[in-house]
Amino acid sequence: YFGKLESKLSVIRNLNDQVLFIDQGNRPLFEDMTDSDCRDNAPRTIFIISMYKDSQPRGMAVTISVKCEKISTLSCENKIISFKEMNPPDNIKDTKSDIIFFQRSVPGHDNKMQFESSSYEGYFLACEKERDLFKLILKKEDELGDRSIMFTVQNED
């Protein structure tokens, strides 16, 4: 069971300091942006991280949403990352959900976070370079020390 608590506005960056944003095709991508670029591209660069109370504490349970014309929420259904047009619900009557991730700090790395899927244990949000695009994907952490699953989350409130 997950019960919604408060929400915060955040900018999410990869290790290259590239900013996560939602492109016109609703794809989550990372791109070089100055602070003014980041502001100019809002709300596509501003993510609503909603925190949830978890009946089985496993880290901070969160959803990640963006409000452009409508609110879309990050999902990892079938291990594929996409934004689904939906509000983060007030309650989820299950111990797993495709939209709930466990946000945890990374040992030895101040201000770095990782996000584990509640639906797929051992699978994390990660940055992957595909041709010239830096994409947000869901990735199994096969090896200790994989830094592609590390992100900076900067509160904008």
Epitope: L15, N16, D110, N111, F134, R147, S148
Partner: antibody
């Protein structure tokens, strides 16, 4: 602009502890998001990452050296330090301090200091 | 840990020529978390490229990076006299952070 400068003894005896300090000038070590790092280069060889510290004092070190490495920070002096215990001749190297913006790559380096381990 | 192998060990070229340096990783660096540095004798390394292809501040555009997974390339389109140096690749996709053994670019 921000500059880094290493200091410490150039000669250390085997089995002793190597101690180096890096002074940050032209900016504050408290700048959020930075990791202050140590990297070494054996004579005529490549580079080896030793570890890092944040201004809050959180450290992370290379597993190959971890048991011998201590990294500390003194924000009041704008300095961070490296201690490497039980040194051998294999620890002879140029030691660099460097700034990691938080990603794991190094955009600013000190000039380096040669430390020789010899009796 | 990820081992980075750079080739060739030495590259002998003339000013104005194109230099192509290779860096091969022992396993995939899918995240594209790879950097390149230049080091001149008696000096500290200088960051050239990060994120495979992103030029660091004040780096001239004759330096470019490319590649993915396990194979990465640094290209210097037209060598200037000040470009003769040793070049290192570094991965930051996995801990511990590791560097390649370097490629020396020397004047032919």
């Amino acid at each position: 602009q921000v500059q880094l400068q290493e200091s410490g003894p150039g000669l250390v005896k085997p089995s002793q502890t190597l101690s180096l300090t890096c002074t940050v000038s032209g900016g504050s070590i408290n700048s959020g998001g930075y990791y202050w790092s140590w990297i070494r280069q054996h004579p005529g060889k490549g580079l080896e990452w030793i570890g890092h510290i944040s201004y809050r004092g959180t450290t992370y070190s290379n597993p190959s050296l971890k048991s011998r490495v201590t990294i500390s920070v003194d924000t009041s002096k704008n300095q961070f330090s490296l201690k490497l215990s039980s040194v051998t001749a294999a620890d002879t190297a140029v030691y660099y301090c460097a700034r990691d913006r938080g990603g794991g790559f190094f955009d600013l380096w000190g000039r380096g200091t040669l430390v020789t381990v010899s009796s | 840990e990820i081992v980075l192998t750079q080739s060739p060990g030495t590259l002998s070229l003339s000013p104005g020529e194109r230099a192509t340096l290779s860096c091969r990783a022992s396993q995939s660096v899918n995240s594209g978390y790879l950097a390149w540095y230049q080091q001149k004798p008696g000096q500290a390394p200088r960051l050239l490229i990060y994120g495979v292809s992103i030029r660091a501040t004040d780096i001239p555009d004759r330096f470019s990076g490319s590649g993915s997974a396990t194979d990465f390339t640094l290209t210097i389109s037209r060598l200037e006299p000040e470009d003769f140096a040793v070049y290192y690749c570094q991965q930051y996709g996995f801990s511990p952070l590791t560097f390649g053994g370097g490629t020396r670019v020397e004047i032919n």
